[in-house]
Interface confidence: medium
């Protein structure tokens, strides 16, 4: 499919100009490469009328350009008076003309309307007012007044003074009689239709001195914006309809065939399932105006859009609307990333999130997408050194990898953890990406004992049973904070004794801390990873208290206090059932409130936009550079 | 947590106008809503005005509509309220407030992070 893009129609009067827009990749070849705009015949081919290198054709002479933004990825053709001899199929393109890196346009030129003498001509949006304002004489003042409206050879009356309104205006017209010393009345049309376009005449009188006005309404589908994005990136719909409607239900839909327009979200809480977990609608303003984010852009989401305001919730006759031509383009710059990401209850993920490389200082976040309240998406963690308090000792956003990739890492998994979660950066606003977490079943691969007890001033040995599909990695302990989780020296132990079916390749990994102290209290993790990227993670939480008896402590799966969540199994080894496990300085109140999320809508349908990945999770070595 | 600290307040007479500015300090805000609260002797913290991140959506109360504009300026961490049309009524303590919520609606319980607040004196 050609990444060239442009709009489809582009309808204007004779005598008028046009200026046409053309889209394409912005790599360096594509900014230096010829660009053109050439008219097709009937058999085929495409003779070029105009085009970067500087050749016109004679038929363009002095009444067309064509100018290349190269930093915009952009070139716009102008053509002024427009003849009907204009009207035709036409490509805008890049390279050689048959090469098909190129976008077909039709431009119908129309001739102007043939107006009356004295004509007043009303051009207004589709959806919005208009006034048509009638003058009269003074003899005139006390007699009827009227609108007529040219069906073919006949007037149809619209509306009058006596109060008649004609049925297919009914709701939504008003005949307005100004003040006595005003010598006219005007006739106020509301939610205009494309079936109000057409001659009117206004008529103060019915007899021979009777005055009239003739009035041409003009009512103007609205041209499509057009928008070019990335695979996999995202677009911001800016919908203003005008502080006329500002207390209408809002929409968003996307054109289907003919006249259909399925609602993608609007305000009043319906949002079409394929959006789920990637779409948010800003609050309005005051004046009407709101805009819908929708993130991880699929192929198939190109199209016509329309955002319009009625008291349904969607698309009807006569509603104000906006529209924009959806253009997806497949040459993305966004590398692919898994859309969904698999981790075990009690376990944990790790999440790559791509940025833009050339924003490696711009700061990282992860937010969890609501779909309460139209969408929203509470921050979880930044490249700051800020964690949210809910997901302390259990949630890591590291810069590794780099190079146009940071991880996020989230351990002791439970199923409210399931959603979608939204990649970030403060950089450049069209990386967004998102990403599905789904909780699935099965045992943790690591193994570690539950929350532990230190004891000032001893030493305390903590240890982290591999399974042998880890042989490969490399295994660390690392203690969490906000920024981060630094790591620690660990003593390979041998082969462990935690896992049937499973040889010499298995390890035990301890953590060692000499000479406990209170600093030494917190959440620790122990980990696999490959380079700088990471796998599983497990967590443990170090509690410090004073000394009760002489001796060093060295932790077993089996020995760790038994806590209410947890059970022993027969082979020695204690596993953390799935729940995260809270600070157990924690109150009662205050583990309730760490351990509720805010309240999103409940209803988390999952969908699988892509490809799904099984992941571990893990944590960093590094500390964050503010 | 980022710390919000609010200035700009004072006596003023009814019809006046005063912008008050709210900079935020220990993270950047350029993802947060902020939001402006007030609070009357005697009376419950109500809501004024709040912005989305980009500042591309604002959003007032019915008594402040036409009269109070919030506005943001990112590069400097700082969210402002001007206040024109100022009535008797209006005397309060001003509080800006901040929301880790990256766009979409925001309702007052998610608003975490609250300045010491500014006093507005409007006299008749």
């Known amino acids: 499919k050609s990444p060239i893009f442009g709009p489809e129609e582009v309808n204007s009067v004779e005598g008028n100009s046009v200026s046409i827009t053309c889209y394409y990749p912005p790599t360096s070849v594509n900014r230096h490469t010829r660009k053109y705009w050439c008219r097709q015949g009937a058999r085929g081919g495409c003779i070029t009328l105009i085009s970067s290198e500087g050749y016109v054709s004679s038929k363009y002479a002095g009444r067309a350009n064509l100018t290349n933004f190269p930093e915009n990825g952009t070139f716009v053709v102008n053509i002024a008076q427009l003849s009907q001899d204009d009207s035709g199929r036409y490509k805008c393109g890049l390279g050689i003309n048959s090469r098909g890196l190129s976008f077909d346009v039709s431009l119908e030129v129309s001739q102007g309307p043939g107006l009356l003498n004295d004509t007043k001509v009303y051009t207004v949006d589709l959806g919005r007012t208009v006034t048509i304002n009638c003058p009269f004489k003074t003899e005139n003042a006390q007699k009827r007044k009227s609108l007529y409206k040219q069906i073919g050879l006949y007037p149809v009356l619209v509306i009058d003074s006596s109060g008649y309104v004609n049925p297919n205006y009914t709701g939504r017209i008003r005949l307005d009689i100004q003040g006595t010393g005003q010598l006219l009345f005007s006739v106020v049309i509301n939610q205009l239709r494309l079936s109000d376009a057409g001659q009117y005449l206004c008529q103060a009188g019915d007899d021979s001195n009777s005055n009239k006005k003739n009035a041409d309404l003009q009512v103007l589908k609205p041209e499509p914006e057009l928008v070019y994005e990335d695979l996999r990136g995202s677009v911001t719909f800016h919908c203003a309809l005008g502080p006329e409607v500002a207390n209408v239900a809002k929409f968003l839909c996307r054109q289907s065939s003919g006249e259909n327009c399925d609602v993608v979200v609007n305000t009043l809480g319906k949002r079409a399932p394929a959006f789920e977990g990637r779409i948010l609608l800003n609050p309005q303003d005051k004046d009407g105006s709101f805009s819908v984010v929708i993130t991880g852009l699929r192929k198939e989401d190109a199209g016509r859009y329309l955002c319009g305001a009625h008291s349904d919730g969607q698309l009807q006759e006569g509603s104000p609307i906006q529209a924009w031509q959806l253009f997806v383009n497949e040459e993305s710059t966004i590398p692919r990333s898994p859309t969904v990401v698999k981790g075990v209850a009690g376990s944990s993920v790790a999440v790559l999130c791509p940025y833009n490389r050339k924003e490696s200082k711009s700061i990282k976040y992860w937010c969890l997408w609501e779909g309460a309240q139209n969408g929203r998406c509470p921050l979880l963690v930044d490249s700051e050194g800020w964690v949210k308090a809910q997901y302390e000792g259990r949630l890591s956003l590291l810069e590794e990898p780099g190079n146009g990739t940071f991880t996020v890492i989230l351990n002791q998994l439970t199923s409210r953890d399931a959603g979608f979660y939204w990649c970030l950066t403060n950089g450049d606003t069209l990386w967004r990406t998102t990403v599905e977490i789904k909780i699935i079943e099965g045992e943790p691969n690591l193994k570690v004992p539950g929350n532990v007890t230190a004891v000032l001033g001893e030493t305390l040995k903590v240890p982290c049973h591999f399974p042998c599909k880890f042989s490969s990695y490399e295994k660390y302990w690392c203690k969490w904070n906000n920024t981060g989780c630094q790591a620690l020296p660990s003593q390979d132990e041998g082969p462990s004794k935690a896992f049937v079916n499973c040889d010499e390749n298995s390890r035990l990994v301890s953590l060692t801390l000499n000479l406990v102290t209170r600093a030494d209290e917190g959440w620790y993790w122990c980990g696999v990873k490959q380079g700088h990227f990471y796998g599983e993670t497990a967590a443990v939480y170090v509690a410090v208290e004073e000394r009760k008896a002489a001796g060093s402590r060295d932790v077993s799966l089996a020995k760790a206090d038994a806590a209410p969540d947890e059970k022993v199994l027969d082979s020695g080894f204690r596993e953390i059932e799935n729940k995260a496990i809270q600070d157990p300085r924690l109150f009662a109140e205050e583990k309730a409130v760490a351990d509720t999320r805010d309240q999103a809508d409940g209803s988390r349908a999952s969908v699988d936009s892509g490809s799904s990945e099984e992941q571990g999770g893990s944590s960093r070595h590094h500390h964050h550079h503010h | 947590e980022v710390q919000l600290v609010e200035s700009g307040g004072g006596l003023v007479q009814a019809g006046g106008s005063l912008r008050l500015s709210c900079a935020a300090s220990?993270?950047?805000?350029?993802?947060?809503?902020m939001g402006w609260f007030r609070q009357a002797p005697g009376k419950e913290r109500e809501f004024v005005a709040r912005?989305?991140?980009?500042?591309?959506?604002?959003d007032y109360a019915d008594s402040v509509k036409g009269r109070f504009t919030t506005s943001r300026d990112n590069a400097k961490n700082t969210v402002y309220l001007q206040m024109n049309g100022l009535k008797p009524e209006d005397t309060a303590v001003y509080y800006c407030?901040?929301?880790?919520?990256?766009?979409?609606?925001?309702?007052?319980?998610?608003?975490?992070?609250w300045g010491q607040g500014t006093l507005v004196t409007v006299s008749s």
């Open positions: 407030a901040g929301s880790a919520y990256y766009s979409g609606y925001v309702t007052h319980r998610d608003f975490g992070s």
């Open positions: 220990g993270r950047t805000i350029n993802t947060y809503v």
């Open positions: 912005i989305d991140w980009s500042g591309s959506s604002t």
